[in-house]
């Protein structure tokens, strides 16, 4: 024989289940029919992206939801979020009926990621949470790719690189001058400056700044990104022997960058030439 | 007893649209789906889809999709098959039967 | 779709001796949950389908023990032991496990 649904087998006997219940108990009355799963709806043809789950009453596979996706409801809500993930927000309860194109007993709500921090992908991309990651995964496996895997929580370490490089400047002696170069890397990198000496036969050799001048200051500060640092060199007053090359030379654990600069000391403002190369400042 | 009473035969001319009922008694209404299935003359049984009785959801099968539409009265008791713009392939025997393991059939209505 | 094939087509008996269908599916109808969603009805002339059996060989309410059914995965059997007057008619058999809900093309008992 067919079995009777449970919510007729709980109203027949409400009378003794209010005699030995306390008046505190609340009991929701969502139950689950047999199982039916050809009654499903069916998955879409090319199948699910975030992979499947079942109704609340283990019958019906479904599509698993991606963050921001509704979950737990009735009707277009109903749905169980992705792994990883969980279903959050307004507490409606509904009467429930499984494996006959019904939506499961629950509440209705969004699908989150429960771990909300950056995590660094096999790709060497860093994903604002691992429900992205996954996402990202699945997406890549279903052209054909490689899945991504996480390879550490936190953002992905990266090598140093230039973001804004220091420019070449003309001026005269006794003027205040100063070059900035702004670099980026994770974990954040450390920023130096070198002065270039080229010696005989093109040999380059380094002095790092700033030494003993005490016409220059070096200064450096976090930002203005995250991961980001920015420092200058400060020539006041600029003489002939600040004249050269200099260096801005960023480092962290994943490798090293740096870009170069000039300084031109002239005697009069009427040497500087009018076409300067590109970037240059006075 | 559980029982599903179907509507009279009904004559048509192609083009034209025929709606039929499906009246349940002698159970919760609302706690299981209602399924159609149609019967060409002389022929087998082939499943069309069901209505969701709880959610109001229809689920067609493909072949079944953009004529045919599923539809409730819940108060009433009644599920509805309705075919437009009718073709001489849909004369057939329709019979609405009730989840679940097609337990209770109602007695058919040729059209 | 899975296709569910009955053999034979017709089965002629005399009452009294035993039957036996044969349903065949293209897929196997056992689901995830361990359950096996086939079914048997009978037609009579003119009349609706009555279910016999669910559930491969769960027997229905007011069913004469003379139904049998077994099988498994892809292959199934109905067995009536003495087929009697009332049997007559088309069996067919049906799968609930894939999308969608499939028949098989049935079998005329005479």
């Known amino acids: 024989m067919e079995r009777p649904s449970l919510r007729a087998l709980l109203l027949g006997a409400a009378g003794l289940l209010l005699l030995l219940l306390p008046l505190s108990s609340s009991s929701s009355s969502d139950t689950c029919g047999p199982c039916e799963p050809a009654s499903c709806p069916p998955l879409p043809p090319l199948g699910c992206l975030l992979g499947e789950t079942r109704d609340a009453c283990g019958c019906c596979p479904m599509c698993a939801r991606g963050e921001g996706e509704p979950c737990g409801g009735g009707g277009a809500g109903r749905g169980y979020c992705a792994p990883g993930m969980e279903c959050v927000k307004s507490r409606k309860r509904r009467k429930g009926k499984a494996g006959a194109a019904a939506g499961g007993p629950g509440v209705s709500g969004v699908c989150v990621c429960k771990s909300r921090y950056p995590v660094c992908g096999s790709d060497g991309t860093t994903y604002p949470s691992g429900c992205q990651l996954r996402a990202a995964s699945q997406r890549a496996e279903s052209r054909g790719e490689k899945a991504i895997t996480q390879v550490s929580k936190g953002t992905c370490e990266q090598g140093p690189s230039i973001v804004t490089p220091p420019k070449d400047i003309w001026n005269v002696t006794g003027a205040q001058v100063y070059l900035s170069c702004e670099v980026i890397g994770i974990p954040t990198p450390v920023l130096i400056w070198n002065k270039v000496k080229r010696g005989h036969y093109g040999v380059q050799r380094t002095e790092l700044l700033p030494g003993d001048r005490d016409n220059l200051a070096i200064q450096t500060r976090g930002g203005p990104e995250k991961h980001e640092v920015t420092g200058w060199v400060l020539v006041s007053p600029l003489s002939k022997e600040d004249a050269g090359e200099y260096e801005c030379h960023a480092s962290n654990s994943q490798g090293q960058a740096s870009a170069s600069a000039k300084i031109t000391v002239v005697d009069a403002l009427h040497e500087i030439p009018v076409k300067k190369g590109e970037g240059a400042e006075l | 007893q559980i029982q599903l009473v179907q509507s009279g035969p009904e004559l048509k001319k192609p083009g034209e649209t025929v709606k039929i009922s499906c009246k349940a008694s002698g159970y919760s209404f609302t706690d299981y789906s209602i399924h159609w299935v149609k019967q060409a003359p002389g022929k087998g049984l082939k499943w069309m889809g069901l209505i969701n009785t709880e959610t109001g959801e229809p689920i067609y099968v493909d072949d079944f999709k953009g004529r045919f539409a599923f539809s409730l009265e819940t108060s009433a008791r009644t599920a509805y098959l309705q075919i437009n713009n009718l073709k001489n392939e849909d004369t057939a025997t329709y019979f609405c039967a009730r989840a679940y393991y097609w337990a209770y059939w109602g007695q058919g209505t040729l059209v | 779709d899975v296709v569910m094939t009955q053999t034979p087509l017709t089965l002629s008996v005399t009452i009294g001796q035993p039957a036996s269908i044969s349903c065949k599916s293209s897929?196997?109808?056992?689901?995830?949950?361990?359950?096996?969603?086939l079914h048997w009805l009978l037609q009579r002339p003119g009349q609706s389908p009555k279910r016999l059996i669910y559930l491969v060989s769960k027997l229905d309410s007011g069913v004469p023990d003379r139904f049998t059914g077994s099988g498994s995965r892809t292959d199934f059997t109905l067995k009536i032991s003495r087929v009697e007057a009332e049997d007559l008619g088309v069996y067919y058999c049906?799968?609930?496990?894939?999308?969608?809900?499939?028949f098989g093309g049935g079998t005329k008992l005479e």
């Open positions: 049906a799968q609930g496990t894939h999308f969608p809900h499939t």
């Open positions: 897929q196997s109808l056992l689901y995830s949950n361990g359950e096996t969603y």
